[in-house]
Interface confidence: low
């Protein structure tokens, strides 16, 4: 349904508050270095223009596309070339190339200062003084640091952020009320950003077909009672929503997501019995709730898959005449029967099935050729099961911090060329799989663990893509989306790596470490551990453990000393000498 003015259409659909918030998110995700005030000015100008179009859709420029309007506005920024360098060249292009150019310059690791949380009283005063500016600043700071954050979901986070301040700033103990809520929002926000980043990478690097396959598998697990035609419709609509958001079309994305939530709730009888509570909530909560809803119960007495996909005489005929629909049906039928499998495993099985049919349907006796295809699935299923079992045992034995350290050593030996901050960040996140998933019963472990690992490894892939340093990382990241985790798991120690020269400065610590939070102190120690492995990749677990134990004792001792700085200087030298001796550096 064509509208005379797209900007007026979206303004009316979304309402002024959401319109302004989404335009701010879009601009902050494109121009990540621009000051807050500049973005607010641009957003206000766009909003005033949208209002003129609502009043008269035939007014000048109201018929222009949103990309044209927003791109023109972004290109008015005076300091574009000084701040963004070659990104300014985008402005010389015409749509749609200009928008594509902006997208290519999104930075997953922008050089921005870490967000420091002010004192609670300071935050509450700012909230009460100007609530609107306070909440806009939240959107701006998150959006510029997470340029692929799922925009309609960020509106939901902002709503919760506002609710936290509204409640806690009038509580007797403001800090006790507010800080746990802010911690929860921060952690959930990071997880949400990483999950969406994988969706965008899937669409942008592997195409719509890859994303649709992922969606068929996930929705079939979640809605096993829904008909294949229903799942197909949801997949088509969901793909459109995420394509729009990943492409910077945030107004269309938010509008279409609302339509999809409405459709799901109007048709919940034929989708899932678990949607009732979600569908009673307001829009933002409803969409979030649907996205997180638990899997429905599997229908009773589902027939064997073999009948339609192995034993039927029509397998090759069905496959030849409608390949993607037939494979989609296979994936749907397999996924709805296996909520205990990870989505990536289901996609590997579908790929194996597809490869077998490609080969066998050209053979002299196709049925004889593909008759044992399900036997090929066994090792594919057992590999993640065994890996998760082993790693959960290790996690339960070591606890999260030491489990992260084991992964730090493992991954630094696999890909020592990767920057130390990236190795620390990724390995810490990989290590969180233990506390996140190992507590689950067997039937929920694999979907929890392997799909989470896909999200974390995608962080490694997008960070590495910005500054590629390892052919092995590039290979694992680009060859197959669903085989990334097995590819990284299969990497052994990189024998070609030339150890880093020893630099005493890397292992020099100061009294400021004593005032850090436990998390920050862990990161300091883990950074040192990565550097140690880079210097001595052949060091044994026992050698590394001994050095790390000495290091922990050194920090504890000096943080208790009266003259901390002197202790760190003198004892630090001794520790470095002892470590060099222990590791033979």
């Amino acid at each position: 349904d064509a509208h005379k003015s797209e900007v007026a259409h979206r303004f009316k659909d979304l309402g002024e508050e959401n319109f302004k918030a989404l335009v701010l998110i879009a601009f902050a995700q494109y121009l990540q270095q621009c000051p807050f005030e500049d973005h607010v000015k641009l957003v206000n100008e766009v909003t005033e223009f949208a209002k003129t179009c609502v009043a008269d859709e035939s007014a000048e420029n109201c018929d222009k596309s949103l990309h044209t309007l927003f791109g023109d506005k972004l290109c008015t920024v005076a300091t574009l070339r000084e701040t963004y360098g070659e990104m300014a060249d985008c402005c010389a292009k015409q749509e749609p190339e200009r928008n594509e150019c902006f997208l290519q310059h999104k930075d997953d690791n922008p050089n921005l200062p870490r967000l420091v949380r002010p004192e609670v009283d300071v935050m509450c005063t700012a909230f009460h003084d100007n609530e609107e500016t306070f909440l806009k600043k939240y959107l701006y700071e998150i959006a510029r640091r997470h340029p692929y954050f799922y925009a309609p979901e960020l509106l939901f986070f902002a709503k919760r952020y506002k609710a936290a301040f509204t409640e806690c700033c009038q509580a007797a103990d403001k800090a006790a009320c507010l800080l746990p809520k802010l911690d929860e929002l921060r952690d959930e926000g990071k997880a949400s950003s990483a999950k969406q980043r994988l969706k965008c990478a899937s669409l942008q690097k592997f195409g719509e077909r890859a994303f649709k396959a992922w969606a068929v598998a996930r929705l079939s697990q979640r809605f096993p009672k829904a008909e294949f035609a229903e799942v197909s419709k949801l997949v088509t609509d969901l793909t459109k929503v995420h394509t729009e958001c990943c492409h910077g079309d945030l107004l269309e994305c938010a509008d279409d997501r609302a339509d999809l939530a409405k459709y799901i709730c109007e048709n919940q009888d034929s989708i899932s019995s678990k949607l009732k509570e979600c569908c009673e909530k307001p829009l933002l909560e409803k969409s979030h709730c649907i996205a997180e809803v638990e899997n429905d119960e599997m229908p009773a007495d589902l027939p064997s898959l073999a009948a339609d996909f192995v034993e039927s005489k029509d397998v090759c005929k069905n496959y030849a005449e409608a390949k993607d629909v037939f494979l989609g049906m296979f994936l749907y039928e397999y996924a709805r029967r296996h909520p205990d499998y990870s989505v990536v495993l289901l996609l590997r099985l579908a790929k194996t099935y597809e490869t077998t049919l490609e080969k066998c349907c050209a053979a002299a006796d196709p049925h004889e050729c593909y008759a044992k295809v399900f036997d090929e699935f066994k090792p594919l299923v057992e590999e993640p099961q065994n890996l998760i079992k082993q790693n959960c045992e290790l996690f339960e034995q070591l606890g999260e911090y030491k489990f992260q350290n084991a992964l730090l050593v493992r991954y630094t030996k696999k890909v020592p060329q990767v920057s130390t901050p990236t190795l620390v960040e990724v390995s810490r996140n990989l290590g969180k799989v233990g506390s996140k998933c190992c507590k689950h019963p067997e039937a929920k472990r694999m979907p929890c663990a392997e799909d989470y690992l896909s999200v974390v490894l995608n962080q490694l892939c997008v960070l590495h893509e910005k500054t590629p340093v390892s052919d092995r990382v590039t290979k694992c990241c680009t060859e197959s989306l669903v085989n990334r985790r097995p590819c990284f798991s299969a990497l052994e120690v990189d024998e070609t790596y030339v150890p880093k020269e020893f630099n005493a400065e890397t292992f020099t610590f100061h009294a400021d470490i004593c005032t850090l939070s436990e998390k920050e102190r862990q990161i300091k120690k883990q950074t040192a551990l990565v550097e140690l492995v880079k210097h001595k990749p052949k060091a044994t677990k026992e050698q590394l453990k001994a050095v790390m134990d000495d290091f922990a004792a050194f920090v504890e001792k000096c943080c208790k000393a009266d003259d901390k700085e002197t202790c760190f200087a003198e004892e630090g030298k001794k520790l470095v000498a002892a470590s060099q001796a222990a590791l033979g550096l």
Epitope: P224, K225, F228, D308, E321, V325
Partner: nanobody
Framework: EVQLLESGGGLVQPGGSLRLSCAAS????????MSWVRQAPGKGPEWVSA????????RYAETVKGRFTISRDNSKNTLYLQMNSLRPEDTAVYYC????????GSQGTLVTVSS
């Protein structure tokens, strides 16, 4: 986009007949086996009948054998269910599905058998 649209339901007296149709689009209809599934009020979905892609092989649930006939016209992308000697216990929403799935579709057509 895969779509299935059922029609032909209605109110009929016991012993009467109805013919249901299912118009399919968005996929190569002639390549897939199809089924009819029904769901009576307050009950789970029940598989009724299936037909292979060419229309040669047909299967029926014991409860409808001899009374119902499934057929298809691949040139029209349409599936049919001819229902004779209808009984009150045949009252349900009828859905067509791709393959031999017992899950229900999104629309369906209501068949009510009552005097």
């Amino acid at each position: 986009e895969v779509q299935l649209l059922e029609s032909g339901g209605g109110l009929v007296q016991p012993g009467g007949s109805l013919r249901l149709s299912c118009a399919a689009s968005g996929f190569t209809f002639g390549s897939f086996g199809m089924s009819w599934v029904r769901q009576a009020p307050g009950k789970g979905p029940e598989w009724v009948s299936a037909i292979d892609s060419g229309g040669a092989d047909t299967r029926y649930a014991e409860t409808v054998k001899g009374r119902f006939t499934i057929s298809r016209d691949n040139s029209k992308n349409t599936l049919y269910l001819q229902m004779n000697s209808l009984r009150p216990e045949d009252t349900a929403v009828y859905y067509c599905t791709i393959g031999r799935s017992t899950s229900r579709g999104s629309q369906g057509t209501l068949v009510t058998v009552s005097s």
